[in-house]
């Protein structure tokens, strides 16, 4: 167990032309805060995937108001470290995402508004207990300077925080088989604490809390002898019987070697033979360098001159992931307003607006009927960002250009009969109804103002009394 610590030194405009506009203004003061997300290994997951090693959010920085005309300076930062505790072993290689967020403090309805200013990501190798590592990352025109380290929480020590240390019981030396704990020479390495109940004779562990069985034993605590039988393919002869052992779960069962590594058993454990480009106990660490061209979709590879230093892919707009392998679905944020259709063209977003709306994000409501003619005597009706034509009798369609069967839309209410006529249509009303479309009952049934049941209810012509 231990803690990953991140110290932000500065966030401001990067070098070179095109300095970014200050994110805050006199009208809209704001303050910054940061979010860090950690994932084990050289993760190739998208930014949205879980922060399996942990995540942390900084405090809010001081409120900042831009001075008119002044260039955007380094922005005031929150106090303190960002700390991400980790419960298990420190993986040695990790991926990080650091996001800079702006909290606008203007007169927001419903509280402050948050927006993401910049996001940087990278992959690094880092031993726990080492010194602070300094880094500079750029996101667009912004530059973030920071330091980070991983430190173990006592009693854990070591580069992975898996060795445990205890104060010496005797002043002169540590117990049998246990070394002094560098750099804490006055403490001794403690034996690994295996899973509670793990058999001391037949079980062992390489990580705290696990229980791995020696050959011939099985069960969660290695207390169950592997049963004997006249097996066909024995793992080895049994000293207890003349039969042979049914194979227990071997250390290579299920192939613990990742990325195509091959597993071979050793007397106490297993060994992975890794393919080119991978290393580590389980071949989980990528040794890929920029020379291998790991960045897809036009991503720019930086660093990684040798297998011991990680490379970073700087992705072009529209792509993300450690290797720029994932297309960003920028339309999922629904940037097009008023029902506009979002098109992600890779290099840019485009909104195809519904009739009656315009602008890059369909944010402008047009006069729906301006310049739109309805043919054949139809009249234009504005409504909901789309013009519609109220067509004269005998015509239909969006612009009243289609000659319609005037009776096709059942224009006569309450069972009236429709007759197509050279001038349009005529409704012959059922007895008791009148109006151009038979929509008015002459005498609604029932004497009371609010009948218990709607009178004269016909299918398709329900009545509602309010």
């Amino acid at each position: 167990a231990g803690v990953f610590e991140l110290q932000i030194h500065s966030f401001g405009p990067g070098p070179g032309p095109g300095a970014p506009r200050s994110p805050c203004s006199a009208r809209l003061p704001c303050r910054l805060f940061f979010r860090v997300c950690l994932k084990p290994g050289l993760s190739e997951e998208a930014a949205e995937s879980p922060c399996a090693l942990g995540a942390a959010l900084s405090a809010r920085g001081p409120v900042y108001t831009e001075q008119p005309g002044a260039p955007a300076p380094d922005l005031p930062l929150p106090d303190g470290l960002l700390q991400v505790p980790f419960r298990d072993a420190w993986p040695g290689t990790f991926s990080f995402i650091i996001e800079t967020w702006r909290e606008e403090l203007g007169d927001q309805i419903g509280g402050p508004a948050w927006s993401l200013l910049a996001r940087v990501a990278g992959r690094r190798r880092l031993a726990a207990g080492g010194p602070w590592a300094r880094d500079i990352q750029r996101a667009g025109a912004w530059e973030l300077r920071f330091s980070y380290r991983a430190r173990c929480e006592p009693p854990a020590v070591g580069t992975a925080c898996t060795r445990l240390c205890r104060p010496r019981s005797a002043p002169s030396r540590c117990g049998p088989g246990l070394r002094p704990c560098a750099p804490l020479e006055d403490e001794c390495e403690a034996p690994l604490v295996c899973r509670a109940g793990c058999s001391p004779e037949h079980g062992f562990c390489e990580q705290p809390g696990e229980c791995r069985c020696l050959e011939g034993w099985t069960g969660p605590l290695c207390t169950v002898p592997v049963s004997t039988s006249s097996c066909l393919s024995p793992r080895g002869p049994s000293s207890a019987t003349t039969g042979c052992l049914v194979p227990g779960p071997g250390p290579c069962d299920g192939n613990p070697c990742a990325n195509g590594g091959s597993c071979s058993e050793t007397p106490r454990s297993f060994e992975c033979t890794c393919p080119r480009g991978f290393y580590g106990l389980r071949c989980e660490v990528s040794g890929v360098t920029c020379a291998d061209g790991p960045c897809f979709n036009g991503g720019l590879c930086v660093g990684g001159a040798d297998p011991d230093s990680a490379y970073i892919c700087h992705c072009p707009p529209g792509f993300q992931g450690s290797n720029c392998e994932k297309r960003v679905d920028r339309c999922s944020l629904q940037p097009c307003r008023n029902g506009g259709l979002c098109l992600d063209l890779g290099h840019a977003l485009r909104c195809r607006c519904r009739a009656g709306f315009a602008g890059p994000r369909c944010e402008h409501d047009l006069d729906d009927c301006a310049g739109r003619a309805c043919a054949n005597g139809g009249t234009c009706v504005e409504g909901g960002g789309a013009h519609r034509c109220s067509c004269a009798l005998g015509f239909g369609g969006r612009d009243c250009r289609e000659r319609a069967d005037p009776c096709a839309a059942r224009p006569c209410a309450h069972g009236g009969r429709c007759y197509a006529h050279f001038s349009g249509l005529v409704c012959a009303c059922a007895p008791g109804y009148m109006g151009a479309r038979c929509e008015f009952p002459v005498h609604p049934d029932g004497a009371s103002a609010l009948p218990a049941a709607p009178p004269g209810l016909r299918p398709g012509d329900p009545q509602r009394y309010l």
Partner: nanobody, 117 residues
Framework: EVQLVESGGGLVQPGGSLTLSCAAS????????MAWYRQAPGKKRELVAG???????DYILSVKGRFTISRDNAKNSVYLQMNSLRAEDTAVYYC???????????WGQGTLVTVSS
Amino acid sequence: EVQLVESGGGLVQPGGSLTLSCAASGSSVKFLSMAWYRQAPGKKRELVAGISADGSTDYILSVKGRFTISRDNAKNSVYLQMNSLRAEDTAVYYCYAYEWTTRYTYWGQGTLVTVSS
């Protein structure tokens, strides 16, 4: 769902005038056929005047020339201008709407008109 609220009823002398208003919500009156009905004590409810979605109007014979039905799309309301009122016009007047898209009919709660000297 369309809601209808009538107003403008009251006591008036014979020969006097009154204007009833019906405010609609939930749909635009330009897409509704609307009408005024009345129900005198002990009698059936009867149609007085109607205005179709296309603007054409209908009146019962006894009010033709005295009553005028009109519609104001901007205010989403329908009106009944009643002139030369008679004692037999005394009734509860109801607003009615026919919605063409759903073919539902809706009624208001009514407003009382009393013509008496």
